[in-house]
Interface confidence: medium
């Protein structure tokens, strides 16, 4: 934890503390933007995106946004403060440690976004029901 | 118990350089990210840059890119930061912090910090 020799204030967006005085660093993501995808159908999909990218403030978690219209499947893996919307949608899954994809309304296509606070996690992309919040061991997780 | 000790602070030139380690010991350091935190005279925290277990994936904050090298030797279970062309601005005291848990960005456990001096 933070010796209490250290001034406990903080300059804007360069360090987050938890309860305990632990300092969060920027959270490492998959950083690729948008980029077509084969990830169709699956229970889980891995994003293939090549480039880990630290976030610029230690308060963005990853995000990964899976879209599928008539032409083409899309998957944006970025950064994002979750206290901002993201494609006007809250980020309201923003402290579990996995990434899990729900579907949101948005019309002419089929739209589903998760995001996630541990290093890289927005690399694994999960749909399968079975990981669905409704899971108490995995809100246990979540909130522990 | 988990400790971590810093060394190599002092005063310098700017432009100058600095080599910072930072020895660790009660935990198992070669499967720990580690990193390096700052605190400059009268301002809040700022972290510095982290390093990955293997050593292998090292990020900074913009202001230190290009100038400043974080390395480790597992095997000494020693966390090293080079510090090159050195600036007023970089004035602090420098702390290591070890990673709380494998995959998460919060990092716990500080050292009792090393003062680096940039003044001419």
């Known amino acids: 934890t933070i010796p209490p020799h250290v001034q406990k204030s903080v300059n804007n967006d360069m360090i987050v503390t938890d309860n305990n005085g632990a300092v969060k660093f920027p959270q490492l993501c998959k950083f690729c933007d948008v980029r077509f995808s084969t990830c169709d159908n699956q229970k889980s999909c891995m994003s293939n995106c090549s480039i880990t990218s630290i976030c610029e403030k230690p308060q963005e978690v990853c995000v990964a946004v899976w879209r599928k219209n008539d032409e083409n499947i899309t998957l944006e893996t970025v950064c994002h403060d979750p206290k901002l919307p993201y494609h006007d949608f809250i980020l309201e899954d923003a402290a579990s440690p996995k990434c899990i994809m729900k579907e949101k309304k948005k019309p002419g296509e089929t739209f589903f976004m998760c995001s996630c606070s541990s290093d890289e996690c927005n690399d694994n992309i999960i749909f399968s029901e079975e990981y669905n919040t409704s899971n108490p061991d995995l809100l246990l997780v979540i909130f522990q | 118990e988990v400790q971590l000790l810093e060394s190599g602070g002092g005063l310098v030139q700017p432009g100058g350089s600095l080599r910072l380690s930072c020895a660790a010991s009660?935990?198992?350091?070669?499967?720990?990210?580690m990193g390096w935190v700052r605190q400059a005279p009268g301002k809040g925290l700022e972290w510095v840059s982290r390093?990955?277990?293997?050593?292998?994936?090292?990020y900074y904050t913009d202001s230190v890119k290009g100038r400043f090298t974080i390395s480790r030797d597992n095997s000494k279970n020693t966390l090293y930061l080079q510090m090159n062309s050195l600036r007023a601005e970089d004035t602090a005291v420098y702390y290591c912090?070890?990673?709380?848990?494998?995959?998460?960005?919060?990092?716990?456990?500080w050292g009792q910090g090393t003062l680096v001096t940039v003044s001419s």
């Open positions: 912090a070890k990673q709380r848990e494998l995959g998460k960005s919060y990092f716990d456990y």
């Open positions: 009660g935990f198992t350091f070669e499967n720990t990210s």
């Open positions: 390093i990955d277990p293997k050593g292998s994936h090292t």
